[in-house]
């Protein structure tokens, strides 16, 4: 898609550039399975430039192609407590809202391992919303350096 | 933070896309958890745009948020050689100097696995120095396919 | 490199931006380690936009440094199905023509896990295509979520 | 076996500043899983946090007591000291020190406890 | 800080007996929530940790639960080792913060 002589004059700022990177704030209640973000500078190092929070969930507001990426590390693990569970922690990252929209973009699972990280590009459009499942009973660390979830704007 | 009429005009080079990709050089000396990193076309793929090098660890030049990614493979290594130590060997990227702004920013564990591997959106300011620390006995591999760090100005 | 009048006066499309998200088509045929990938709307989240497909192989068609990322994740997987192999299969993501070029860019070993995920800068030029080597004899996923492959160009 | 033993002066005189210092065995604080801690308890009371220290030196303090506190690491000789100044009878209590993981504050090895008294 | 409301600050039971002891956080903290006994003279143990998750070698009659502010400890069958002090603790957020105790004490 050509962008417009006044996109071309405007501040790339506003071609989109689009960004996030949020730090856990908690997981949900039981039945819950989504994990609650939180972003700003008074927490640190997170930040929302363009997406927003809704009740813990990132919501997009600027359609494009998105990098989206993520970084969990469980609290209290060892090989043995992610290996010994019948069904193996997994954490999903889709889209759950609009129900229209619903579909998993990124799934990992910790197998024997205490941490899961990975990245891809997906479109998505304003509106949006991204929601962060973790099955099972072991709970994430609140670390900064530990778990993270950002997106990046990267074209229209 | 809008860009003025003159940044607009001149080359994009010029509002930033600093980025660097470096490769193993050496680990540091016993008490040193550091890992000391080299880049330039000369030793391969490795590259330094904007960034330098301080006696082997990265320093920022230019303010913004950037995304920074490493992967590290431990070079003798099997599920037994990760597992039986008593504590997993960890690697951190941090913010070692200045010291005010230290901080750690990425943290993971080896646990039964061999390499690790992640990525995070972070600020970062003109002057400061990234340091990757690998606790542990055991030793990095130096394929520039298996370990490598890397930072990316994506925005400011 | 400086960008011409030319190119700053052309939309931001014309500097690059060029980008494709693959997911599974299928593996190879005995003898033939490398990962056959698809993309395009039709197919779902996968995309081509600039990089295209040559027998299931990634083609970059603009110089310039690229932001590569892969994920794969193991269909038929436990702990002890990538662990009781006496070679763990690996992932290696290279250049593989013009062979003039051929290098391995990316190596990742599974070990005790199912999935690797991982990602790095990396200079590429006109024509270079992109191979994905899987060696072993477990079977990737073709779940959209769990096995993808993308490249994305950062800057001159 | 993880084992942690806390050394130091039984009686420290208003003012001063009270030292101890803690040595650990059956783990080595470099090894970067956990954050070594100081927590205090009042004869009778309840138990507060004072602050830790991670093998790189950095340190994370109870606000309530920051202004006072100092926690530094030895990791050649496996230790990790406390420093509080200007003590006064208040900071009579039982000093532990107290092992965390780094990904979880959970206190899961202690020591047996000293006993500081503040008094002239 | 969080501060964290321990009830009864002690209670009378007897062997056999189930006893249940609370503690509120002041504000949410999810299940990032532990439980400690201290026996007199020595130093706290590990009860329960992440809310109900029992540490390694505790007996089986302690459990606990919680909603994310209100949190109890289970003790289903009290026995005579039983008889001590216990702290909850939050790991949420620095500062670490414990309740005041619970004293449990023979009837």
């Known amino acids: 898609q050509r962008l417009s002589r006044a996109q071309q004059q405007l501040p790339l700022e506003s071609l989109g550039w689009d960004i996030a990177e949020l730090q856990l704030n908690h997981t949900g209640p039981q039945q819950d399975p989504r994990l609650y973000w939180q972003g700003g500078p008074a927490l640190g190092r997170s930040f929302l430039r363009g997406p927003e929070l809704d009740k813990g969930q990132l919501r997009i507001r600027r359609d494009g192609i998105y990098m989206v990426h993520i970084q969990v590390t469980l609290a209290i693990c060892s090989s043995t407590s992610t290996s010994r569970h019948h069904h193996p922690t997994t954490l999903a990252v889709g889209i759950c809202s609009p129900a229209s929209r619903s579909i998993s973009l990124l799934r990992l699972s910790f197998h024997q391992g205490c941490t899961i990280a990975s990245q891809r590009l997906t479109p998505l459009a304003r509106g949006d919303t991204l929601c962060t499942n973790l099955t099972g009973t072991l709970l994430p660390s609140r670390n900064t350096d530990e778990t993270f979830f950002g997106v990046q704007w990267v074209r229209p | 933070q809008r860009l003025s009429r003159a940044q607009q005009q001149l080359p994009l080079e010029s509002l930033g896309w600093d980025i660097a990709e470096l490769q193993l050089n050496h680990t540091g000396p016993q008490q040193d958890p550091r890992l000391y990193w080299q880049g330039g076309p000369a030793l391969g793929r490795s590259f330094l745009r904007g960034p330098e090098l301080d006696k082997g660890q990265l320093r920022i030049r230019r303010d913004g948020i950037y995304m920074v990614h490493i992967q590290v493979t431990l070079a003798i290594c099997s599920s037994t050689s990760t597992s039986r130590h008593h504590h997993p060997t960890t690697l951190a990227v941090g913010i070692c100097s200045p010291a005010s702004r230290s901080i750690s920013l990425l943290r993971l564990s080896f646990h039964q696995g061999c390499t690790i591997a992640s990525q995070r959106l972070t600020p970062l300011a003109r002057g400061d120095t990234l340091c990757t620390n690998l606790t542990g006995t055991l030793l990095p591999s130096r394929n520039t396919d298996e370990t490598f760090f890397g930072v990316q100005w994506v925005r400011p | 490199q400086r960008l011409s009048r030319a190119q700053q006066q052309l939309p931001l499309e014309s500097l690059g931006w060029d980008i494709a998200e693959l997911q599974l088509n299928h593996t190879g045929p005995q003898q033939d380690p490398r990962l056959y990938w698809q993309g395009g709307p039709a197919l779902g989240r996968s995309f081509l936009r600039g990089p295209e497909l040559d027998k299931g192989q990634l083609r970059i068609r603009r110089d310039g440094i690229y932001m590569v990322h892969i994920q794969v994740t193991l269909a038929i997987c436990s702990s002890t199905s990538t662990s009781r192999h006496h070679h763990p299969t690996t992932l290696a993501v290279g250049i593989c023509s013009p062979a003039s070029r051929s290098i391995s860019l990316l190596r990742l070993s599974f070990h005790q896990g199912c999935t690797i995920a991982s990602q790095r800068l990396t200079p590429l030029a006109r024509g270079d295509t992109l191979c994905t080597n899987l060696t072993g004899t477990l079977l990737p996923s073709r779940n959209t979520d769990e096995t993808f492959f993308g490249v994305q160009w950062v800057r001159p | 076996q993880v084992q942690l033993q806390e050394s130091g002066p039984g009686l420290v005189k208003p003012s001063q500043t009270l030292s101890l210092t803690c040595t650990v065995s059956g783990d080595s604080i470099i090894s970067g899983g956990y954050y070594w801690s100081w927590i205090r308890q009042h004869p009778g009371k309840g138990l507060e946090w004072i602050g830790y220290?991670?093998?790189?030196?950095?340190?994370d303090y109870n606000p309530s007591l920051k202004s006072r506190v100092t926690i530094s690491v030895d990791t050649s000789k496996n230790q990790f000291s406390l420093k509080l100044s200007s003590v006064t009878a208040a900071d009579t209590a039982v000093y532990y020190c107290?092992?965390?993981?780094?990904?979880?504050?959970?206190?899961?090895?202690w020591g047996q406890g000293t006993l500081v008294t503040v008094s002239s | 800080d969080i501060q964290m409301t321990q009830s009864p600050s002690s209670l009378s039971a007897s062997v056999g007996d189930r006893v249940t002891i609370s503690c509120r956080a002041s504000?949410?903290?999810?299940?990032?929530f532990n439980w400690y006994q201290q026996q007199p003279g020595k130093a706290p143990k590990v009860l329960i940790y992440?809310?109900?998750s029992l540490q390694s070698g505790v007996p089986s009659r302690f459990s606990g639960s919680g909603s994310g502010t209100e949190f109890t400890l289970t003790i289903s069958s009290l026995q005579p080792e039983d008889f001590a002090r216990y702290y909850c603790q939050q790991s949420y957020s620095t500062p670490w913060t414990f309740g005041q105790g619970t004293k449990v004490e023979i009837k």
């Open positions: 107290a092992r965390s993981g780094y990904s979880y504050a959970l206190f899961d090895h």
């Open positions: 992440a809310e109900s």
């Open positions: 504000q949410f903290i999810g299940r990032y």
């Open positions: 220290i991670f093998y790189s030196g950095s340190t």
